[in-house]
Interface confidence: low
């Protein structure tokens, strides 16, 4: 099984650059599209860009264009993500992940924490608005309290249809436990990923989707994210924290 192993934590000054590595063990990167996703504290996951394996073609999210560079060393089975002109808002955990041709991300690296210490400097200016085409994924509720054995339903609404030009709907669900990388649960709306318990199910179409846990178990208390990979830039919901009802 492929494993993605990332480089260690980095502490950087504003204005500096950081280069994070992602090494594939158990296989080479030659056949894989590698994507980079980041997660700032308390924020949703953000897709940054990818590199194609056969020609090293890259595509970046408009938000990071000009600041991010993704490269690959084929012989070392390693992909790299370099982010320049760092500012405090870039403090985040950066993940590399492999694109599967069913449209989801799996597996994920363990994450690399990048801390940009401001040293008392002023905050940077706000980023420019997107090109108007980014799909916003709205999850509800933000927090859900249930008792073990109860049913839990999480909703995810997309700002436009997620039907891809190939006819598929690339809407996926991930579970993230504290200190861990996201883990794929459901891909393409309703397909349970390997070894995911049958109590997890996904449904929906067009713009409205639901993740259901038929009988919640103690290990299910985590944060759940929906994600769409039908349209670039790929986007994630804000997350739903499933907690034990006290």
């Amino acid at each position: 099984q492929v494993q993605l192993v990332q480089s260690g934590a980095e502490l950087k000054k504003p204005g500096a650059s950081v280069k994070v590595s992602c090494k594939a063990s158990g296989n080479t990167l030659t056949n894989y599209v590698i994507h980079w996703v980041r997660q700032a504290p308390g924020q949703r996951l953000e897709w940054m860009g990818y590199i194609l394996p056969y020609n090293d073609l890259t595509k970046y999210s408009q938000k990071f264009q000009g600041r991010v560079t993704i490269t690959r060393d084929k012989s070392a089975s390693t992909a790299y993500m370099e982010l320049s002109s760092l500012r405090s808002e870039d403090t985040a955990v950066y993940y590399c992940t492999r694109w599967d041709w069913d449209g989801f991300f799996d597996p994920w690296g363990q994450g690399t924490t990048v801390t940009v210490s401001s040293g008392g400097g002023g905050s940077g200016g706000g980023g420019s608005g997107g090109g108007g085409s980014e799909i916003v994924m709205t999850q509800s509720p933000a927090t859900l309290s249930v008792s073990p054995g109860e049913r839990a339903s999480i909703s995810c609404r997309a700002s436009q249809s997620l039907v891809h030009s190939n006819g598929n709907t690339h809407l996926h669900w991930y579970q993230q436990r504290p200190g861990q990388a996201p883990r794929l649960l459901i891909y393409s709306v309703s397909n349970r990923f390997s070894e995911v318990p049958a109590r997890f199910s996904g449904s929906g179409s067009g713009t409205d989707f639901t993740l259901t846990i038929s009988s919640v178990e103690s290990e299910d208390f985590a944060v759940y994210y929906c994600s769409q990979t039908s349209h670039i830039p790929y986007t994630f919901g804000g997350g739903t924290k499933l907690e034990i009802k006290s």
Epitope: Q1, T28, T30, Y50, P53, Y54, W101, G167, I232
Partner: antibody
């Protein structure tokens, strides 16, 4: 030169099974998926499934899920396909083919094919 | 499944002329600017041989008279000029999504 060597022919009885082999040479076996393709006499090509020799992970065409079973033997750089419960419909040429890297989701090198004849 | 419709089913072309084979997919086979459509040549008693990968890339050792074009769901294989050695059956194949599928084939005869 990359080669995928397959036995020329197999004559088998209905209801039995047959195991077809595909020996790879002149490249790193674990770096490329192996796909299998069926071609009935005078017919087109049908994708059966694929195996990742590195992990053993398989994916099948729904149509062949209960018919074909794909395995690999890493030490000998050999991919195998077992076909079970054979009927006359399974009489065909079966190709193994390599996929990955430069050609990226295209089958670049093909074996010569094994002709399977199911007859009593 | 993605259905690939090739036309014509057979084609007779004079030596030195241009041959054009069309392949239409029932849905888009393009992804992030890449078209996962490929062309193969098969001669009697031989396995298919890759000619063109990802719509327009000529495989190594394939003569430049072969070219591929198209995107989304419409693709074309062109042979210009046709040579005697080109008499064969030509297949398009998509690897956008499984099950990976092939066109029905176009038999090219040299007049």
């Amino acid at each position: 030169q990359v080669q995928l060597q397959q036995p020329g022919a197999e004559l088998v009885k209905p209801g039995t099974s047959v195991k077809l082999s595909c020996k790879a040479s002149a490249y790193t076996f674990t770096n490329y998926w192996i796909h299998w393709v069926k071609q009935r006499p005078g017919q087109g090509l049908e994708w059966i499934g694929r195996i990742d020799p590195n992990s053993g992970d398989t994916k099948y065409n729904e149509k062949f899920k209960s018919k074909a079973s794909l395995t690999v033997d890493k030490p000998s750089s050999t991919a195998n396909m077992q076909l079970s419960s054979l009927t006359s419909e399974d009489s065909a040429v079966y190709y193994c083919t390599r996929w990955g890297d430069l050609h990226y989701y295209a089958m670049d090198y093909w074996g010569q094919g094994t002709s399977v004849t199911v007859s009593s | 499944d993605i259905v690939l419709t090739q036309s014509p089913a057979s084609l007779a072309v004079s030596l030195g002329q241009r041959a054009t084979i069309s392949c239409q997919a029932s849905e888009s086979v393009s992804f992030t600017g890449t078209s996962l459509m490929h062309w193969y040549q098969q001669k009697p008693g031989q396995p298919p041989k890759l000619l063109i990968y990802r719509a327009s890339n000529l495989d190594s050792g394939v003569p430049a008279r072969f070219s591929g074009s198209g995107s989304e769901s419409d693709f074309t294989l062109t042979i210009d000029p046709v040579e005697e050695d080109d008499a064969a059956v030509y297949y398009c194949m998509q690897s956008m999504e499984d099950p990976y599928t092939f066109g029905g084939g176009t038999k090219l005869e040299i007049k």
